[in-house]
Interface confidence: medium
């Protein structure tokens, strides 16, 4: 189910830290390939990717996102594809460079 | 302003299928995943489906899985369902809707915009 | 699945006068990860719903601050400070700590 797919992303949640939108990392030929630590869900096409399953997925963190983040780190929630700051105290705004 | 426009929508028979679509605009649609709610006519409100921002992942309500598809285009900022082996209980009225507010660690999403919906009839 | 109940079904009240709104989930909304994933919408007559409140108590943009949410656990409660005209339909209060999600009956607020 949903739950095991959103607490397999193992991200920490501080109230006192502000997190802006989410956004959507470039598409590449890695987009559909399966993570292998991540539990089962229904994939477009039906697909299990099951000759796939050891490769690792890229972060876009690690890649197109690596300075995408000001003042904030950045963070990758591979179950909506989509890419998010973790601003700093006092910093705001999609890449945490508000104040 | 966020706007999300839903058709497609009808009268069809049991058995048969329907493709309803919503059209986004206002927003960077490709950076949101999206969600279809239908309301039954004793007007109660049932989650339909979920689909993540690139289309890769999509998720159900056991009553649909098997006879309902969650789709989108985000080159054409729209979201597609197609309903196959449409049942009488299938009838209600099908809305979009953006999953949000975007909050870091708010996994479980509330949806902040709904379009004005489509309506379905499934009866013989 | 998780069921949530909305009682009663309809809420008179008058122009001015505060008002409570209740919901109960058949089991704990808290979630492994501290939060709880509880929210509420707003559908005026004829309209479609529209998000008010957003994991209990966190209102949503554009949302007056005459509305107010709180609970824990199984029990929730949206209040009215001051309702206005506009506050009139019908109030839904909606889980997604567990899938599938799962929506309340509605509470119509109407005029006593």
């Known amino acids: 189910g949903l739950n095991d797919i959103f607490e397999a992303q193992k991200i920490e949640w501080h109230e006192s830290v502000r997190v802006e939108q989410v956004v959507k990392p470039p598409q590449n030929k890695t987009e559909s390939e399966n993570t292998s630590d991540k539990p089962k869900r229904k994939k477009k096409g039906g697909k299990n990717g099951k000759n796939r399953r050891n490769r690792k997925k890229k972060n876009p963190c690690n890649a197109e996102f690596q300075n995408f983040c000001i003042h904030g780190e950045c963070k990758y929630i591979e179950h909506l594809e989509a890419v998010t700051c973790k601003c700093q105290q006092e910093y705001f705004g999609e890449r945490c460079g508000e104040k | 302003e966020v706007k999300l426009v839903e058709s497609g929508g009808g009268l069809v028979k049991p058995g048969g299928s329907l493709k309803l679509s919503c059209a986004a605009s206002g927003f960077t649609f490709s950076s949101y995943p999206m969600s279809w709610v239908r309301q039954t006519p004793e007007k109660r409100l049932e989650w339909v489906a979920t689909?993540?921002?690139?289309?890769?992942?999509?998720y159900y309500p056991d009553s649909v899985k098997g006879r309902f598809t969650i789709s989108r285009d985000n080159a054409k900022n729209t979201l597609y369902l197609q309903m196959s082996s449409l049942r009488s209980e299938d009838t209600a009225m099908y809305y979009c809707?953006?999953?949000?507010?975007?909050?870091?660690?708010?996994?479980?999403?509330?949806?902040?915009?709904w379009g004005q919906g489509t309506s379905v009839t499934v009866s013989s | 699945d998780i069921v949530m109940t909305q009682p009663p079904l309809s809420l008179p009240v008058s122009l001015g006068d505060q008002a409570s709104i209740s919901c109960r989930s058949s089991?704990?909304?808290?979630?492994?990860?501290?939060?709880?994933?509880l929210h509420w919408y707003l559908q005026r007559p004829g309209q479609s719903p529209k998000l008010l409140i957003y994991k209990v108590s966190n209102r949503f943009s554009g949302v007056p601050d005459r509305f107010s949410g709180s609970g824990s656990g199984t029990d929730f409660t949206l209040k009215i400070s001051r309702v206005e005209a506009e506050d009139l339909g019908v109030y839904f209060c909606?889980?997604?700590?567990?899938?599938?999600?799962?929506f309340g009956g509605g509470t119509k607020l109407e005029i006593k």
């Open positions: 689909i993540s921002t690139g289309g890769t992942y999509t």
């Open positions: 089991q704990s909304l808290v979630h492994s990860d501290g939060n709880t994933y």
């Open positions: 909606s889980q997604s700590t567990h899938v599938p999600y799962t």
């Open positions: 809707a953006r999953q949000g507010p975007i909050y870091y660690g708010n996994y479980y999403y509330a949806m902040d915009y």
